[in-house]
Interface confidence: low
């Protein structure tokens, strides 16, 4: 009889126990910090905090706060138990506290706009000062019911850590209510007001005749002139000018949840959808060894790229990542920091026809605004949890 433990199927020092009751014929007893049928998945210690529906548990970006869930498939809430919200006006209506809902058409499919009473001014008529919100602001987890401009979008938790993406935009214009609703509001079509979420742009999207072609030729190293437009994502930066050393120009480090078995496809989707959404050329950067700058999170390299500080207690809770990135894990989802190059050469005052964020900080504000109004997550292959803009410097070799 073959011993199922003979092949040493348990990674990271897990101990194997043969058992007829298991589908694999064995059970791995995993050391602290790892989980999955073969102990190959890094497991942040979440204590009693469980993430449902495939959600990933991640350490809080803020020391001293509990871990949080990055939810998938539209689920929400602290444990990913909140069912996905319907598209458009529902039912149930996404507008709380007797707000009235009107359907809109935006780039991400059916959307909605709430007309709210003065007492509840959030995008979904939330009450940022509502009971129970005081202790939740800035805890690293987005509490949608506490998100609105009055509460700094739950202390930045619902806006990628940016307390006020519309800072500098006149408050009386209420552009945060009109952002990316599919209609042009000229009073919001400015840098300070984040170009009304590009609702005033024409054409709003890459023409269908070009879209598939541009998809197939996105960031392939060759400039496709027909794809070198804002609405087609600037060909993923393939047509950027060659002056200077643009490969190590400005970049964004994104903390995103992706599925390791389909990582390449999802990285491609992430780069293209962000290029189209932000109307700038974006691509996954490569290090000097020619490897994608994609780092498992949590991990020292990932956190270095994010520019954040590691929770000092976290090192004791989870074993370090020792697995090469290419190895598929048992997990359906995992955290990664993806460093993306950005071509901003078509943006700025010298290119008035192309409204787009002309520096990485403005890009971050735009992404934060999209996150704040719930327009970002439906477009991406997985939840985007944090963004850190970088000025241009040559990266060190990837040591993974």
């Amino acid at each position: 009889e073959i011993d199922p433990c003979h092949s040493q199927p348990c990674f990271h020092g897990g101990t194997c126990e043969a058992t007829a009751g298991s589908p694999l014929g064995f059970i791995c007893h995993c050391p602290k910090g790892f989980e999955g049928p073969t102990c190959s998945h890094r497991a942040p210690s979440c204590g009693f905090h469980h993430c449902h529906h495939g959600g990933l548990c991640l350490p809080s970006p803020k020391p001293g706060f509990p871990p949080r869930c990055a939810c998938l498939s539209g689920y929400g809430g602290p444990d990913c138990l909140t069912p996905p919200a319907p598209k458009g006006c529902g039912p149930p209506s996404p507008c709380l506290y007797n707000g009235s809902c009107s359907e809109t058409t935006g780039l991400g499919g059916p959307g909605f706009r709430c007309s709210c009473p003065h007492s509840s001014p959030g995008p979904r008529c939330q009450k940022p000062g509502a009971k129970g919100c005081e202790g939740r602001s800035g805890d690293g987890a987005c509490d949608a019911g506490c998100s609105g401009p009055g509460g700094n979008w739950d202390g930045g938790d619902c806006s990628l850590g940016v307390p006020d993406p519309w800072k500098g935009c006149p408050s009386h214009s209420r552009c945060w209510l009109l952002f990316r609703d599919g209609q042009c509001h000229p009073q919001c079509d400015s840098e300070e007001c984040l170009f009304d979420g590009y609702d005033c742009e024409t054409p709003p999207a890459c023409t269908p005749a070009y879209d598939q072609y541009c998809h197939d030729h996105f960031h392939n190293g060759h400039c496709e002139k027909g794809c070198n437009t804002a609405e087609c994502g600037w060909d993923g930066g393939d047509c950027r000018p060659e002056d200077g050393d643009p490969e190590w120009g400005p970049s964004l480090a994104l903390l995103v949840v992706l599925s390791p078995p389909a990582l390449d496809q999802q990285l491609f989707a992430l780069a293209r959808v962000l290029s189209l959404t932000l109307r700038v050329g974006l691509w996954v950067r490569k290090d000097r060894d020619g490897r994608d700058m994609v780092y498992p999170y949590p991990g020292a390299r990932a956190e270095e790229k994010l520019g954040g500080t590691r929770d000092p207690t976290y090192q004791e809770r989870a074993a370090p990542q020792t697995q090469p990135l290419g190895k598929e894990t048992d997990s359906l989802s995992a955290g990664f920091v993806v460093v993306m190059g950005v071509d901003l050469s078509r943006c700025g005052p010298d290119h008035p026809a192309s409204r787009c964020p002309w520096d990485p900080g403005l890009l971050l504000r735009f992404l934060a605004a999209m996150a704040a109004v719930g327009a970002l997550e439906p477009l991406l292959p997985g939840p985007l949890l944090a963004v850190h803009p970088h000025a241009g410097t040559a990266p060190p070799a990837n040591q993974l």
């Epitope: 989980e35 469980h50 449902h52 529906h53 495939g54 809430g77 138990l81 909140t82 069912p83 039912p91 149930p92 009971k131 129970g132 019911g145 359906l332």
Partner: antibody, heavy 115, light 107 residues
Framework: EVQLVESGGGLVQPGGSLRLSCAAS????????MSWVRQAPGKGLEYVST????????YYANSVKGRFTISRDNSKNTLYLQMGSLRAEDMAVYYC????????WGQGTLVTVSS | EIVMTQSPATLSVSPGERATLSCKAS??????VAWYQQKPGQAPRLLIY???TRHTGIPARFSGSGSGTEFTLTISSLQSEDFAVYFC?????????FGQGTKVEIK
């Protein structure tokens, strides 16, 4: 069509054990959390236990914690409830149900605890 | 654990009339509340989830409302097939819990 079929109920003495099974079909079993809910004769519904989609997380009502164990075999599309140290108050019809909004239920299996 | 309290225990209503069932949670459960209908000898049937979303195939006469700690199931015009026991359930936090039920009977 979603179907959940419970089995394994029967008569057991106090202190005894029993294993219930729930065979699922008509949906991707491995994608859904599953639960057990029970109903004593003439009484209301009582939540018993939940297991997440991959079997990595389990939850129990306080009344059964330490005595009952929920598990699943995704390769067989089957949910289990191992019940031990059974008491008279555990006598009920046991239903398996899908996810947290229990949209789909089995027909139930009766567990009788009596000496 | 969160206690769900339903009232009244029994509701006597004539066919065609409106029935209003109440469910109170011992602490804030947001809108993570479901309502079920159960008839003798049958498994429960999901009517409403997410406090106010009607499940597929549920007639429009059933509606749910509320958030936080107070929830209501309304049957706008009772039909003969609606006389049954109704349970509320919270799935905001573990262990999930049910109310004790409200029996809707013919007046």
């Amino acid at each position: 069509e979603v179907q959940l079929v419970e089995s394994g109920g029967g008569l057991v003495q106090p202190g005894g054990s029993l294993r219930l099974s729930c065979a699922a079909s008509g949906f991707t079993f491995s994608s859904y959390g599953m639960s057990w809910v029970r109903q004593a004769p003439g009484k209301g519904l009582e939540y018993v236990s939940t297991i997440n989609s991959n079997g990595g997380r389990t939850y129990y009502a306080n009344s059964v914690k330490g005595r009952f164990t929920i598990s699943r075999d995704n390769s067989k599309n089957t949910l289990y409830l191992q019940m031990g140290s059974l008491r008279a108050e555990d006598m009920a019809v046991y239903y398996c149900a899908r996810d947290q909004g229990f949209a789909y239920w089995g027909q139930g299996t009766l567990v009788t605890v009596s000496s | 654990e969160i206690v769900m309290t339903q009232s009244p225990a029994t509701l006597s209503v004539s066919p065609g009339e409106r029935a209003t069932l109440s469910c109170k949670a011992s602490q804030d459960v947001g809108t993570a509340v479901a309502w079920y209908q159960q008839k003798p000898g049958q498994a429960p049937r999901l009517l409403i989830y997410w406090a106010s979303t009607r499940h597929t195939g549920i007639p429009a006469r059933f509606s749910g409302s509320g958030s936080g700690t107070e929830f209501t199931l309304t049957i706008s015009s009772l039909q003969s097939e609606d006389f049954a026991v109704y349970f509320c359930q919270q799935y905001s936090s573990y262990p999930w819990t049910f109310g004790q039920g409200t029996k809707v009977e013919i007046k």
